[in-house]
């Protein structure tokens, strides 16, 4: 059968029918349903929601919907022994204590099982000592402290403001600096937008609001006790001392009311420059310790959280493909939340739910996609991307042979200004073409395309008339699919205006105030931005699953490879003496990129011309496209990060959320001037150039004519 016969409806009608079936009102209804109680990973409430979603996806018409469970390491506060931080006087008396919980939002005062703010996976401990303010606790902040200001954090408790980088990187940096505890806080400079009221009167963070979150440094490992393998019934588990990525010092988060009390007494060195000052009425002195009158007072942490192996549940739905059932397009997003999950994750889960409903409606009318679509509701994302990673570990052999694409579906909104897309270069043209066909929801762009409003509000820094599309980093469930398995991946959501809003993320992120009302009152009352995101995510899945030729353009990879090679060469050339001394050459990399560009161009020409009615040739060409992303995987992984195997992209070693290009070379060059053995360090740079050049050349050859 031809593809059109197999799928009953003509391709153009399919896509239109699918998109027309998506309704803002349904997304609103689903969001309300998913946010009335907390759905913390490992709890009964989240298990019940998994079963509800399973049941509803079956009703919507999927072929099968199964729960996939794993027993993974999670972390919870001790219910009878709360975590807090004190200021103690010279006699050891607690003269100030931080709050034990966030004041609940109106209407939620009687909700039980709201987990108090905590840093997941913090070890237990009661360290006491002098405080050092370390700004955002980024690599460069510790360089400034240790190298320029000669401030030693060893044996100190550090206080860092949230923002700029993943909190796990902050904790790692503090550990490496010798700190014995970490206090994380939300500064109004980063989490309070000027001119907006605090929740419940606006979308800003109140002084008692606190950001929860895990502080692991897993580097893609998944469950800390079973790296590389699923945490199933017969799993061999590491001892806690050998667990991957656990922090070694106590960590606790606080709000800015409590932070004010700690920071207002700080003495020692003045802040090095204005970039170290937040918006509190405190001096932002670095310390160590408190100023004159308070110099005998210390800070003490009281952390009693426990790590527990706990059962988690993914929901996996299948819509079997009519023509290529052994080719999988995956739409996945997490279900677990820190509290109500008004934005993270349920604004995404509600969109996935509506996408499933729309696909189900088409299926009930006799349609099937060309390829199989898998839908996933992941568990324990907030605890380190555990549900998605364990499932991918369990199914890795199938995924590496059959995985066409993964589309992520966490929070649909982090603002309401414009679209934000991060994806593999293979999907650039898909995203461009799709957004040209969708209507913009933005004020002032009535009757205009989404592409037009997006390009106007978020222009590409390199190509005029095109929108910005960013590199994939991590911090979400696409990680295992892209960084470990090399499956083409993408994500889309509505975002803020980064130029006018300098706060990090959205102010109420991971707080108790992330409610349904936050979204319905302040972010998207008409749910039009949610609908647009549903159309983008759903439209991408539809095209990936249904187009006869996969909608991947390998020429776009050639363009970015050149850009990344230019960038890393420029970084390296900042050390010209060493480049000359150690004969460091980028010739092999530039040559490989040139070859890739030429071969990709020829492949694209063949793609236009081949006989699409020949199913063998069609499958062959599609397989070359599908396996191109896979060709960038190095089976040995990156140095000290075996589960980050993509040679072109990896999460930054300094910020898990950010993507880095040619990460092997980048990390080898990073701070190379401080290395004790320059010959060895530059030898590693040369080795990484070799690995990158080989990988690009090998990937190019997968696009050559097969014989």
């Amino acid at each position: 059968k031809s593809s059109n016969e197999a799928t009953n409806i003509t391709p153009k009608h399919n896509m239109k029918a699918f998109l027309d079936e998506l309704k803002a009102e349904n997304i609103k209804k689903f969001l309300y349903n998913f946010t009335q109680i907390p759905h913390l990973a490992g709890t009964e409430q989240n298990f019940q929601l998994a079963k509800q979603i399973q049941s509803q996806w079956k009703e919507f018409g999927l072929d099968s919907v199964e729960l996939a469970h794993y027993d993974v390491l999670l972390s919870y506060p001790n219910k009878t022994h709360p975590n807090y931080i004190s200021i103690i006087n010279e006699d050891g008396n607690e003269i100030f204590n931080t709050s034990l919980f966030e004041p609940p939002p109106p209407g939620y005062e009687n909700v039980s099982d709201i987990v108090p703010p905590f840093s997941a996976f913090s070890p237990q401990g009661m360290p006491e000592g002098d405080l050092v303010y370390v700004n955002y606790a980024r690599t460069e902040d510790f360089f400034k402290l240790e190298r320029d200001m000669k401030i030693n954090c060893s044996g100190k408790i550090v206080i860092a403001r949230y923002g700029k980088v993943f909190r796990g990187n902050k904790v790692k940096n503090a550990q490496l600096a010798g700190a014995k505890g970490v206090i994380l806080y939300s500064d109004p400079a980063d989490y309070f937008a000027p001119g907006v009221k605090s929740y419940p009167d606006g979308w800003n963070l109140p002084g008692g609001g606190v950001q929860r979150g895990n502080i692991l440094n897993l580097n893609g490992a998944g469950d800390p006790l079973t790296p590389g393998y699923p945490a199933n019934e017969y799993a061999y588990r590491r001892g806690i001392a050998e667990a991957v990525g656990l922090p070694s010092i106590p960590v606790h988060p606080i709000g800015y009311y409590d932070a004010q009390k700690l920071l207002e007494k700080m003495g020692g060195s003045a802040p090095p420059d204005s970039s170290w000052r937040g918006s509190l009425k405190v001096p932002y002195n670095v310390g160590p310790g408190f100023t004159g009158n308070f110099s005998t007072q210390k800070v003490k942490m009281h952390i009693h959280s426990t790590n527990e192996v706990t059962r988690i549940y993914n929901v996996i739905g299948t819509l079997r493909g009519a023509v290529e059932p052994d080719r999988y397009v995956i739409l996945g997003g997490h279900r677990d939340s820190w509290v109500f999950g008004g934005i993270d994750p349920q604004s995404g889960a509600a969109v996935v739910h509506e996408i499933v409903r729309s696909f189900g409606t088409l299926k009930k009318e006799g349609w099937r996609p060309r390829r199989t679509i898998l839908f996933a509701s992941w568990d324990a994302e907030e605890f380190g991307l555990l549900g998605s990673t364990e499932w991918a570990e369990e199914n890795s052999r199938l995924l590496q042979e059959r995985g066409v694409a993964y589309i992520n579906a966490d929070s649909s909104i982090e603002g309401n200004y414009t679209l934000r897309v991060d994806c593999t270069p293979l999907m650039y043209s898909l995203v461009h073409n799709l957004t040209k066909e969708l209507k913009s929801p933005d004020e002032g762009f009535e009757g205009k395309s989404l592409y037009e409003s997006w390009t106007k509000k978020s222009p590409s820094p390199e190509f005029s008339g095109m929108p910005r599309i960013s590199k994939l980093g991590s911090g979400n469930d696409f990680e295992v699919f892209f960084q470990r398995l090399g499956i083409a991946s993408g994500r889309a959501r509505y975002t803020k205006n980064w130029e006018t809003n300098k706060f990090s993320g959205y102010p109420l992120y991971h707080s108790v105030y992330e409610t349904y009302e936050l979204v319905e009152k302040f972010y998207d009352p008409m749910f039009k931005y949610h609908l647009t995101v549903a159309q983008v995510r759903g439209g991408m899945v539809f095209e990936l699953a249904n187009s006869i030729v996969l909608p991947f353009d390998c020429r776009d990879y050639a363009v970015v490879l050149r850009k990344y090679a230019d960038k890393i060469y420029s970084i390296s050339m900042k050390h010209p003496q060493e480049m000359k001394t150690y004969s460091v050459s980028f010739d092999s990399l530039f040559s490989a990129v040139k070859n890739f560009t030429e071969i990709a161009s020829k492949f694209s020409e063949r793609l236009q011309d081949f006989d699409k009615s020949n199913p063998i040739v069609l499958r062959m060409m599609n397989d070359q496209l599908m396996f191109l992303e896979r060709a960038f995987i190095d089976p040995l992984g990156l140095p000290d990060r075996p589960f980050y195997r993509h040679v072109i992209y990896a999460p930054s070693s300094h910020n898990k959320y950010a993507g880095e290009s040619f990460p092997g070379i980048y990390d080898a060059l990073f701070d190379i001037e401080s290395k004790v053995d320059p010959s060895k360090a530059w030898g590693e740079v040369k080795r990484q150039i070799y690995v990158a050049a080989f990988t690009v050349q090998a990937a190019a050859e997968t696009l050559s004519e097969v014989a």
């Epitope: 390199e462 050149r562 850009k563 090679a565 230019d566 960038k567 060469y569 420029s570 390296s572 050339m573 010209p576 480049m579 000359k580 004969s583 460091v584 050459s585 980028f586 010739d587 530039f590 040559s591 990129v593 040139k594």
Partner: nanobody, 113 residues
């Protein structure tokens, strides 16, 4: 064989301008990022600027930012460095660099009153 030949150096007064050129041959010029590196008398090598495959992607040392402009003409296989508001501390031999290992012979720029 890769060849890089710099020209355009000379003596110039402080505040003056010069334009350096680097004629490239023996390789596919447009496929490579290129750089300028300088060496002041009695000093080590100092990176000045790099350029990618087009004139959009450029990078400069802080010491020359806003005064120097790197550019390229792929059709002529030539790299340029436009140097404005020259200072005495810009006095150096300026080298054109291909991939880290292929260097020109250099051209001397002297800034003096």
């Amino acid at each position: 064989e890769v060849q890089l030949v710099e020209s355009g150096g000379g003596l110039v007064q402080p505040g003056g301008s010069l334009r350096l050129s680097c004629a490239a041959s023996g390789f596919s010029f447009s496929s490579y990022a290129m750089s300028w590196v300088r060496q002041a008398p009695g000093k080590g090598l100092e990176w000045v600027s790099s350029i990618g495959d087009n004139n959009n992607s450029t990078d400069y040392a802080d010491s020359v930012k806003g005064r120097f402009t790197i550019s390229r003409d792929n059709s002529k296989s030539t790299l340029y460095l436009q140097m404005n508001s020259l200072r005495a501390e810009d006095t150096a031999v300026y080298y054109c660099v291909k991939d880290g290992v292929h260097w020109g012979q250099g051209t001397l720029v002297t800034v003096s009153s």
